[in-house]
Structure formats: structure tokens, C-alpha cells
């Protein structure tokens, strides 16, 4: 394997992680795939300090993060424990609202215009943030 010791071009380093901020939108699953192809993941917010950092860079724009409950319980894409971890929901959120008329509820979390979190329809084309950790050994699969 190999270790990344500095952030790629156009990524921002912060606290031993690299962040990439999109400037156009995709559905949550497509944003997730984008990050994965970059050997990254949708941003996982683990502290108030990281929340403020991300919020500063995205501004007052709806932006996907790596949190969803498409399979039942809320889960972070990197396996970080949701129940014991940092949360910053808007009051009365998440509410799995069905009243939008798009079918189903709301299974994907995003930063709202004030930075606090809301659950929304995963198909909405919001901006997103990718994150990858520095010094993390990337596992290169053996060639057949």
C-alpha cells in the first residue's frame, strides 16, 4: 500500500484530513460515488471544530455529508458511531418528512444554510464535501 502525506491539488488540508468542496450538485448516491472514485468519502463530522471548518468553506448552501439512514438507523459512511458521535441537527430534525410529494421519506443528511443539519430526499442535487485522511495507508488490491 501507499500513504498520502499531502493533500491533492484543489483539496484543503485541515487537522490531518483533506477536504474537497464541490461547486455544483449531485444526488447523494452520485456524490458518494464521486468521493469513492477519489479514494475519499463524503465528509464525516466528528466535532464542533470540524463542523465550523466545513461550514466556513461551504457557506449558506445545502450540502450533502456522509450520513444517511437508507437502511434503517442513521449511519456515517466511514463507520463512525452515530449514536455516541457529534450531532448538529436543526430543531425537530431529522423528521423523515413524507410531505414533499417525491415519494418516500428523507434518508440523507445535509448542511443547511445556517450549517445545522436536516434530512432530505437523497435525489436532490445538492453540493457535497469529500474527505480523506492523511497518513492512512491505502490498500492496493493484489493484481490477478
Amino acid at each position: 500500500g501507499s500513504e498520502r502525506t499531502c493533500c491533492p491539488v484543489n483539496w484543503v488540508e485541515h487537522e490531518r484530513s483533506c477536504y474537497w468542496f464541490s461547486r455544483s450538485g449531485k444526488a447523494w448516491a452520485d456524490a458518494d460515488n464521486y468521493c469513492r472514485l477519489e479514494d475519499a468519502h463524503l465528509v464525516v463530522v466528528t466535532s464542533w471544530e470540524e463542523q465550523k471548518f466545513v461550514q466556513h468553506h461551504i457557506g449558506p448552501v445545502n450540502t450533502w455529508m456522509g450520513l444517511h439512514d437508507q437502511n434503517g438507523p442513521w449511519k456515517w459512511v466511514d463507520g463512525t458511531d452515530y449514536e455516541t458521535g457529534f450531532k448538529n441537527w436543526r430543531p425537530e430534525q431529522p423528521d423523515d418528512w413524507y410531505g414533499h410529494g417525491l415519494g418516500g421519506g428523507e434518508d440523507c443528511a445535509h448542511f443547511t444554510d445556517d450549517g445545522r443539519w436536516n434530512d432530505d430526499v437523497c435525489q436532490r442535487p445538492y453540493r457535497w464535501v469529500c474527505e480523506t485522511e492523511l497518513d492512512k495507508a491505502s490498500q492496493e488490491p493484489p493484481l490477478l
Epitope: S24, L37, D39, Q139
Partner: antibody, heavy 118, light 107 residues
Framework: EVQLLESGGGLVQPGGSLRLSCAAS????????MNWVRQAPGKGLEWVSA????????FYADSVKGRFTISRDNSKNTLYLQINSLRAEDTAVYYC???????????WGQGTLVTVSS | DIQMTQSPSSVSASVGDRVTITCRAS??????LAWYQQKPGKAPKLLIY???SLQNGVPSRFSGSGSGTDFTLTISSLQPEDFVTYCC?????????FGQGTKVEIK
């Protein structure tokens, strides 16, 4: 200067296998996602597969899933496509293409022709 | 899968003409669209990305516009080397898909 050079194409019988290679130079290969895109004679382009810089993430078109395997050897700056259970409809020129900023396909090789025929 | 439909499939024009090619996506792809130029027997070359951004080294006579589902590639003044094939590609969702191509021919 970015260069991508495909090889490994040829004539193969239906059901047969081939391994295509793409030798890369002129950029930091291990940091770049890579793709295979094919073009059947007289037809349009069809995206086949993508792989992340580390090789840890791969994506495939439904038409090749389970038959084609994309891989890479970053120590050799080389991208591969293992193609099995070949069908007549797999006959095409196969291009490797590099993902640039925002994953746009900014550089392409010259292609290698795969012909599936008995 | 997202279908990309180009029109026309071919267009006849003369040197100096303005030519517009359209590409329609079967669903909203915001601005995740690229345009490529392909000469016979050669690999595609990226012209436009993000619907309207000109790739480095591409002449300014090429321009792109549109968002959502409808996009256009415009060549403001055709040059002799421009009489080749052009295609669009969406990078919004896997599988990435291409239009069938538009051939620009000499009238």
C-alpha cells in the same frame, strides 16, 4: 506530456479472454482515477469501467459486470482490463482515459482493437 | 441509466459558418456535461467540461452552454480542421454515458 499507450488487443474467439494494458506517463499515476471506454466499429463511445487511484474502488457498466475486471499496478504506472467470456458485441476499440479535475476524461490513449470472431 | 440524445446526427456547413449541436439528457444532470471532438481513427479530445468551461488549449471558437437537461455546443466560425465528429458525455451518474455523435461535414 501526458501519454497513455494501450496494448493487448487482437482477434479472439467467442468465449475467450484477453488482458489489455495501458502504460501511463507524464503525470502522477497513483493519484489519478482511470477509465476504459470502448467504441464499436461505426458506433458511439461507451464507458466501460473506472478505478480509483489506489485501486480500492471500481465501477463497471452493466454490460460488462462480472466479465471484465479493471485493475492497476501503480509501481508500473499501468492500467489493466481483464476481459473474459468475450462476445461478438465486445468487438471495439478500447481506450484508456485519465480522470482530470472533477473526473472529466481529459487525456485518452490511441486505443487498441479487440475483435471477437470465430 | 441516463440517455444522451444528440441532434442532428450530421450537419453540412461551410468554412466560416456558425454551427450549433444540441445534446439532451433523459434526466437532470445539472452541469455535469462534457463535449469531445473525435477525428477519424483517433481518440476523443476533451473540448468543454462542466457544460461551459473551455479545456486548456482549445480554441475560443468553441463554446458550450446549458444546464439541467438541454445543452449546446457552438462553433462560432468553422475552420477546415473542425469537420469531424462531436459527442457529449454526462458525468452526473454511473454509468457515464455518451451521445451517439454528430458529424460535421463540408457542404
Amino acid at each position: 506530456e501526458v501519454q497513455l499507450l494501450e496494448s493487448g488487443g487482437g482477434l479472439v474467439q467467442p468465449g475467450g479472454s484477453l488482458r489489455l494494458s495501458c502504460a501511463a506517463s507524464g503525470f502522477t499515476f497513483r493519484n489519478s482515477a482511470m477509465n476504459w471506454v470502448r467504441q464499436a466499429p461505426g458506433k458511439g463511445l461507451e464507458w466501460v469501467s473506472a478505478i480509483s487511484g489506489s485501486g480500492g474502488t471500481t465501477f463497471y457498466a452493466d454490460s460488462v459486470k462480472g466479465r471484465f475486471t479493471i485493475s492497476r499496478d501503480n509501481s508500473k504506472n499501468t492500467l489493466y482490463l481483464q476481459i473474459n467470456s468475450l462476445r461478438a458485441e465486445d468487438t471495439a476499440v478500447y481506450y484508456c482515459a485519465k480522470c482530470g479535475r472533477e473526473q472529466w476524461l481529459d487525456y485518452w490513449g490511441q486505443g487498441t482493437l479487440v475483435t471477437v470472431s470465430s | 441509466d441516463i440517455q444522451m440524445t444528440q441532434s442532428p446526427s450530421s450537419v453540412s456547413a461551410s468554412v466560416g459558418d456558425r454551427v450549433t449541436i444540441t445534446c439532451r439528457a433523459s434526466q437532470n444532470i445539472t452541469s455535469w456535461l462534457a463535449w469531445y471532438q473525435q477525428k477519424p481513427g483517433k481518440a476523443p479530445k476533451l473540448l468543454i467540461y462542466s457544460a461551459s468551461s473551455l479545456q486548456n488549449g482549445v480554441p475560443s471558437r468553441f463554446s458550450g452552454s446549458g444546464s439541467g437537461t438541454d445543452f449546446t455546443l457552438t462553433i462560432s466560425s468553422l475552420q477546415p480542421e473542425d469537420f469531424v465528429t462531436y459527442c457529449c458525455q454526462q458525468a452526473n451518474s454511473f454509468p457515464w454515458t455518451f451521445g451517439q455523435g454528430t458529424k460535421v461535414e463540408i457542404k
